[in-house]
């Protein structure tokens, strides 16, 4: 139903959903701190622009009595319950920040007349693509999929001279929320990734994965998985791996690979790590101390959500335009604004663009090195290391099908 918005007469409110079920197990206090830090910045920006207005956030907590799994499994109803709570209290702001779970975002978008913008730190799944009033500030699955297809097709680099058209995908159901939806997108038979590949099989058991590593009859040399190095080690251990196997480890929200003192363990030599370009260095921020890299990205997305709202509010107020209109609700896309950590670019559908980085382990230095970068905004790959010191034969990535190319 239509809810009146606290969003006029020089007073602008942000509704922040503080859900017990979240994409990342982050203390809500840290997210509150991130939001409050963002509010201070927005107030400063509006003041600088000569706009004498008030901007506040209302934190909407769920009671946690029913929906208490802590992860995203029971988030669908929690999101709707919170919306009902907002509706009953007549406390909707100009914008809704949260939820982060794909299930809840999808359902809330479906079940409400959204005349206000929704900003999410998460909602990674394909079911949240192309939503007209939804903005996502952490890389969604679609962006990963487009990189993988682009990389698979690439065959004109010194270190990759074969197009690939096959892959195994390891997905055992214990993944984090981001990984769950990334792998879900790769598994989906109707997705772009599946459409572009000739062969794709999902490995669901540890033993299936382990067997493939030395199976002479395997149908692909490439295995995609999602998680950190420790996750891979638990699965692979020190098992022997055929020399033409390539493991693609998707670990987007982890910048530890770039730290000076990090040495790549031996079990990472057959692995290419896909991560985001480093720089989410919230080291001097009150809300970010003692946060893991993933949680830092999550808190940063909340903060940037506030800055995005401030950016749009400033533009509309300077142009003398109304905030409680469909035009405002649909405006949070196809733009760049100054985020906490640098410029943030949103694509035509309101999804954050970023630079993805593919790393390899140098056999000489045992360090992670940048092989190439990929700009999600233009869907383009940029080679960085033209003569990588790979473990693979001739310092080239093997063909994806055993029996062809370097073995």
């Amino acid at each position: 139903s239509q809810v009146s918005q606290n969003c006029h007469n020089g007073s602008y409110e942000i509704s922040v959903l503080m859900m017990g079920n979240s994409a990342f197990a982050e203390p809500l206090k840290n997210l509150e701190d991130a939001v409050n830090e963002g509010l201070e910045i927005v107030r400063g920006r509006l003041q600088n622009a000569g706009l004498n207005v008030t901007v506040n956030a209302t934190f909407m907590y769920s009671d946690g009595l029913i929906h208490n799994s802590g992860d995203c499994r029971s988030s669908t109803c929690e999101g709707l319950d919170l919306l009902r709570k907002i509706s009953n209290a007549q406390r909707m702001g100009c914008v809704l920040i949260g939820p982060s779970c794909t299930y809840s975002t999808f359902q809330m978008y479906l079940d409400t007349e959204l005349s206000y913008p929704m900003i999410s730190a998460g909602s990674f799944g394909l079911s949240c693509d192309y939503k007209e009033t939804l903005t996502r500030l952490m890389s969604p699955a679609r962006k990963l999929m487009y990189f993988l297809v682009n990389f698979w097709k690439t065959n004109d680099l010194p270190f990759k001279t074969y197009s690939w058209s096959t892959s195994y995908v390891y997905k055992n159901g214990t993944e984090t929320e981001d990984c769950f939806w990334y792998l879900n997108a790769l598994e989906a038979s109707v997705s772009y990734f599946s459409h572009e590949l000739g062969f794709k099989v999902v490995l669901r058991q540890d033993k299936e994965f382990q067997d493939i590593l030395m199976d002479h009859n395997r149908k692909s040399n490439v295995i995609i998985m999602c998680g950190g190095p420790e996750f891979l080690y638990k699965l692979k251990g020190d098992r022997a791996v055929a020399e033409d196997i390539v493991i693609i480890l998707v670990d987007l929200f982890n910048d530890q690979y770039f730290e000076d003192n990090v040495t790549a363990p031996d079990y990472m030599k057959n692995v290419l790590v896909l991560t985001l370009s480093p720089g989410n260095s919230l080291l001097n921020s009150s809300f970010s101390r003692n946060l893991s890299p993933t949680k830092r990205d999550f808190a940063l997305a909340y903060l940037n959500g506030i800055l995005l709202f401030g950016h749009m509010l400033k533009i509309f107020l300077e142009n003398g335009e109304n905030i409680t209109t469909p035009k405002f609700a649909h405006a949070f896309r196809n733009l760049t604004f100054e985020g906490y950590d640098g410029p943030v670019t949103l694509d035509d559908w309101g999804d954050v663009d970023s630079t993805m980085v593919l790393l390899y382990t140098s056999v000489d230095t045992k360090k992670y090195k940048v092989l190439l970068t990929y700009d999600t905004h233009v869907n383009k790959t940029y080679p960085v290391d033209m003569s990588p010191t790979f473990t693979w034969k001739n310092s080239k990535l093997p063909n994806d099908i055993t029996g062809r190319g370097p073995q």
């Epitope: 201070e40 910045i41 400063g44 920006r45 003041q47 600088n48 622009a49 720089g279 989410n280 260095s281 919230l282 080291l283 001097n284 921020s285 940063l300 100054e338 985020g339 906490y340 950590d341 640098g342």
Partner: nanobody, 119 residues
Framework: QVQLVESGGGVVQPGGSLRLSCAAS????????MDWYRQAPGKQREMVAT???????TYTDAVQGRFTISRDNAKNTVYLQMNNLKPEDTAVYYC?????????????WGQGTQVTVSS
């Protein structure tokens, strides 16, 4: 009224060091990242370094590894530590702050401080 005041320029020998400061009004300093630019005689103004609100910094290739930008939130001041200076670093250095304008630079400029590297 937005104010940016640079200081710390001077004459230094090649290989020497200087530390530039830029004191800003608190409402600008707390709301935006800040940049250092420089303009050598007869040349276009070029960006040297940027520091974002988080403290993350980026540099132009010419100064990478020699210059360090930092911010002191208590003093509303941004610094540019310049080491291993070269004659080609000779220029007027400007602090740039505030929202980005249509021309992709920030709205407010300081008055500039002269850096001369010469033996």
């Amino acid at each position: 009224q937005v104010q940016l005041v640079e200081s710390g320029g001077g004459v230094v020998q090649p290989g020497g060091s200087l530390r530039l400061s830029c004191a800003a009004s608190s409402n600008i300093f707390r709301a935006y990242g800040m940049d250092w630019y420089r303009q050598a005689p007869g040349k276009q103004r070029e960006m040297v370094a940027t520091i974002w609100l988080s403290g993350r910094s980026t540099y132009t290739d010419a100064v990478q590894g020699r210059f360090t930008i930092s911010r002191d939130n208590a003093k509303n001041t941004v610094y540019l530590q310049m080491n291993n200076l070269k004659p080609e670093d000779t220029a007027v250095y400007y602090c740039n702050a505030g929202p980005t304008t249509a021309s992709s630079v920030r709205q407010y400029w300081g008055q500039g401080t002269q850096v001369t590297v010469s033996s």
